[in-house]
């Protein structure tokens, strides 16, 4: 039940051993009690004991004190449990009976007689405090106390609030006297089922399943889950957001696995060679003469450099070489001659000059011959003097270059410009390319040579009135009307009533100049726009520190690093090129990204919304101006948009809008 009415019998006095009918008990009144508890009645009536009833065994004879007994037969206080909301009022009937029969179950014995009875009616609040009372009549006296208490797990003024203390998966609490939950230390929530995480545990990046714990969501680490984990493939880098790979000093590459100081760290170059931090392996060795190999580890033949002169033959020795000189020469390299001009040592018409008072000589060679004795024929083509694939030809004392089509000059160094003959019509800009000239056409024209006027011409509809001349503007939708004498307005629609003495020539000249000026400004703007839109190929720069670039061709926004203000960002969306976007002449400032890219605002379990920033966040870029249009960079898994602010250095009128 929800509560218990408890009645403690304390003392019964029946000194004369009399029954209610005036007779006396023989040999004495063997007394037991019947208790009936019912709803409040102003006048107690017979009928069912609606709140319960109980009987005692024989507790004594005539007069006796009733001791407390917690178990077994003759339990005191008496318990009357109920399983309803306690109403706060009651009627109680206590009857004392004499039995001649069985002591243990006297209520069933025949011949029982009433000794006395008392009726109590009134109100009684639930509580632990006993209410004590004493009832007398002419023959008997009964001392007793009573109270109403709630059963285990029931609380409140009427024992109507159920609360069972627990410490399990469904809750961790004790019960307050009023039945409300009191969470055990470390737990919170309506049902005390939410643990209080370690103090300082990051609200988004961490969670806990028991008190004082801090479990990190994917990509985060540390006691408070406020430190990121670098990318899986990262080797010598750190992160400021999960899965990033920002290289430590001296390291480069996508996963920071290229040693930018390989020479210092590993000293790979042998035999005194010079090491430079470049090349496919991160280093290059420049060997000293006499050494070769990737690390200059291989010693060349000492004779490989042809040290012997004047026809001397070279012989390798263990650590050096030896020159065997032909007759007439001596010295380590056969560099000294024993001949003189008298021996006619100069060949091919060389003239001999005596040196050192006639003890040696020097030959002065005619063109096309060289060597100390003019014995070698000069090949003027050995230095590959002809550029751009020109063929070198020895022609007597000189050489000539035979140039490929499109090139000229002594060394074929001059490119014959295809643009020299101005092949581009309608003011198109000409670019010399290997396969011929390419024209960049102004607005309103197309074709290889800008010879085709785009049919969607603003002037085609004849927007100018009164015989005005129409000129197409910068874009196909723009036009300018050059008004004839006597008309004004953007379409020359308004006639002007002018006095006879009006200075027509001056006005016509003024209007003409204004129109020319407008057209000139438009052309300048157009040329500038074209130049702005052209990718700046010379200043391409390698993107370092890119992290996980594979996930569905999404750009991990915070991982883009581009310090080149004119860099164009191209996105390859695999086979489906319709998903590709190109950003030109816009700077994506890496340092702005963490602050600008918000967390996904999706409800539900943490990872769905917390794949933040450096992870696989799709970039959606749109522009509000046609000339700033940027194709969406998209993917089948685009489920969450993030905002990126793109700020143009050069075109302030282009405002890039973003979706979140």
């Amino acid at each position: 039940g929800s509560g218990i009415f408890q009645l403690r019998l304390q003392e019964f006095v029946n000194q004369r051993g009399m029954l209610a009918n005036g007779q006396s008990c023989e040999p004495g009144c063997r007394t037991f009690f019947r208790i009936c508890l019912k709803h409040f009645q102003a006048t107690f009536s017979e009928g069912p004991c609606t709140f319960g009833n109980v009987s005692t065994p024989v507790l004594g004879t005539n007069s006796f004190v009733v001791r407390d007994k917690n178990s077994g037969s003759g339990r005191n206080p008496l318990q009357l449990p109920f399983n309803f909301t306690w109403p706060g009022t009651f009627s109680l009937n206590i009857q004392a009976w004499h039995t001649p029969g069985d002591d243990l179950r006297p209520e069933t014995s025949p011949g029982n007689s009433l000794i006395s009875q008392i009726i109590i009616q009134g109100s009684l609040a639930v509580g632990k405090i006993w209410r004590t009372d004493e009832q007398n009549d002419t023959l008997t006296r009964l001392s007793y106390s009573y109270r109403v208490i709630c059963s285990d797990n029931y609380y409140g003024e009427s024992c109507s609030r159920l609360c069972k203390k627990r410490d399990d998966h469904f809750g961790h609490y004790e019960c307050q006297p009023d039945g409300s939950l009191s969470c055990l230390p470390g737990w919170t929530g309506k049902y005390c089922d939410q643990p209080i995480c370690l103090s300082g545990c990051h609200e988004q990046n961490g969670y806990c399943s028991k008190p004082d714990e801090c479990i990190c969501r994917p990509g985060w680490q540390g006691r408070l889950c406020n430190e990121c984990i670098p990318h899986n493939g990262c080797r010598h880098g750190t992160c400021s957001i999960p899965w990033q790979c920002a290289c430590d000093e001296g390291w480069g590459g996508l996963f920071c696995d290229q040693d930018l100081n390989y020479c210092t760290h590993h000293s790979p170059c042998k035999n005194g060679s010079t090491c430079s931090n470049s090349g496919p392996k991160g280093y290059t060795c420049t060997c000293l003469p006499g050494y070769t190999g990737e690390h200059c580890e291989l010693g060349l033949s000492k004779c490989a450099s042809n040290p012997c002169r004047n026809g001397g033959s070279c012989k390798d020795q263990e650590n050096s070489y030896h020159c065997l000189c032909p007759p007439g020469y001596y010295g380590q390299h056969c560099e000294h001659s024993t001949l003189t001009c008298a021996d006619s040592p100069c060949f091919n018409g060389g003239s001999c000059r005596e040196r050192n008072q006639g003890s040696s000589y020097a030959c002065e060679c005619p063109p096309n011959f060289t060597g100390s004795n003019c014995e070698k024929k000069v090949d003027r083509c050995t230095s590959n003097p002809c550029a751009n694939g020109g063929q070198c030809q020895n022609r007597g004392p000189s050489r000539t270059c035979r140039c490929r089509p499109g090139f000229t000059g002594t060394h074929c160094e001059l490119h014959i410009s295809d643009c020299a003959r101005s092949p581009c019509a309608h003011g198109g800009t000409c670019h010399d390319l290997e396969n011929g000239p390419v024209c960049t056409c102004p607005a309103g024209f197309s074709g290889r040579r800008c010879e085709v006027r785009i049919t969607h011409d603003a002037c085609a509809s004849g927007p100018c009135f009164n015989g005005a001349t129409c000129y197409t503007g910068l874009s196909p939708n723009n036009f300018v009307c050059n008004c004839p004498y006597g008309f004004v307005g953007s379409r020359c629609e308004f006639p002007v009533g002018l006095p006879p003495s009006f200075p027509w020539v001056a006005v016509s000249l003024g209007v003409g100049l204004v129109v020319l000026l407008v057209l000139l400004v438009m052309v300048v703007v157009a040329v500038r726009q074209l130049r702005l839109r052209r990718p700046d190929d010379e200043s391409r720069e390698a993107m370092n520190n890119l992290s996980d670039f594979q996930k569905d061709n999404l750009i991990p926004a915070a991982q883009l690093k581009n310090t080149n203000q004119k860099k164009e960002l191209e996105v390859d969306c695999g086979l489906d090129k319709s998903n590709c976007g190109k950003l030109q002449n816009h700077t994506l400032d890496y340092n702005l990204a963490p602050g600008l890219l918000g967390r996904g605002g999706m409800p539900g379990k943490y990872p769905h919304s917390d794949k933040s920033l450096g992870e696989k966040v799709p970039l959606r870029l749109h522009s509000e101006k046609p000339e700033c249009r940027i194709s969406a960079i998209c993917s089948p898994r685009d489920s969450m948009y993030q905002s990126v602010c793109l700020i143009s250095e050069e075109r302030n009128e282009c405002v890039i809008a973003t979706e979140v």
């Epitope: 399943s209 479990i215 990190c216 969501r217 994917p218 990509g219 985060w220 680490q221 540390g222 006691r223 430190e227 984990i229 670098p230 899986n232 493939g233 990262c234 080797r235 010598h236 880098g237 750190t238 430590d248 996980d548 996930k551 379990k605 990872p607 769905h608 794949k611 696989k616």
Partner: antibody
Framework: EVQLVESGGGLVQPGGSLRLSCAAS????????MAWVRQAPGKGLEWVAT????????YYRDSVKGRFTISRDNAKNSLYLQMNSLRAEDTAVYYC???????????WGQGTLVTVSS | DIQMTQSPSSLSASVGDRVTITCRAS??????LAWYQQKPGKAPKLLIF???DLADGVPSRFSGSGSGTDFTLTISSLQPEDFATYYC?????????FGQGTKLEIK
């Protein structure tokens, strides 16, 4: 090239202790969280413990809590697992791995066998 | 703890075959799932992380898909070196847990 080399395994009696070491190279050890993962003979893989790179915070599977201690020495590029009060069910090949409990284990050592038997 | 169940526990296939291994999580783990390959007497090797991202140096014949509770590893054309045991692992919930493994044998 990333390399993780475990050592310290061997035969030990129940209740005994063992200390495993893992020498790391080919990456900046101090930048990355590390873990121990074990595999009982003929069985599957089981995560044992993790230590963060940032502040050395440690986590353990329930069955080894209070008996095993994971630690690291960034100056020596080394990871350790101190195993006390060993039980027969701790018998396994112990792998040192780079990763946390909430990230993939990107690199693994060759493993060291720990046999707990009387 | 999250239970990871792989199926089949073993399978036989021939070189050139297309093979699919599945992994089921007892709770939604989003895309926080990895696949590993282990050859006898060797350490496991990371193949795929975040459900579908290939680890560095892994051939493109390996691919992964799924999200939530159901995931698959596919080998488009089996090569002799692919015969091994494959494990899935979730790292969405603490503690991380592995599947029991799928042994891929030569038919």
């Amino acid at each position: 090239e990333v390399q993780l080399v475990e050592s310290g395994g061997g035969l030990v009696q129940p209740g005994g202790s063992l200390r495993l070491s893992c020498a790391a190279s080919g990456f900046t050890f101090s930048n990355f969280p590390m873990a121990w993962v074990r595999q009982a003979p003929g069985k599957g893989l089981e995560w044992v413990a993790t230590i963060s790179s940032s502040d050395g915070t440690t986590y353990y599977r329930d069955s080894v809590k209070g008996r095993f201690t994971i630690s690291r020495d960034n100056a020596k590029n080394s990871l350790y697992l101190q195993m006390n009060s060993l039980r027969a069910e701790d018998t396994a090949v112990y792998y040192c791995a780079r990763g946390y409990y909430n990230s993939p284990f990107a690199y693994w050592g060759q493993g060291t066998l720990v046999t707990v038997s009387s | 703890d999250i239970q990871m169940t792989q199926s089949p526990s073993s399978l036989s296939a021939s070189v050139g075959d297309r093979v699919t291994i599945t992994c089921r999580a007892s709770q939604d783990i989003y895309i926080n799932l990895a696949w590993y390959q282990q050859k006898p007497g060797k350490a496991p090797k990371l193949l795929i992380f975040d459900t579908s991202d290939l680890a560095d140096g892994v051939p493109s014949r390996f691919s992964g898909s799924g999200s939530g509770t159901d995931f698959t590893l596919t080998i488009s054309s089996l090569q002799p070196e692919d015969f091994a045991t494959y494990y899935c692992q979730q790292y969405d919930y603490y503690p991380p847990t592995f599947g029991q493994g799928t042994k891929l044998e030569i038919k």
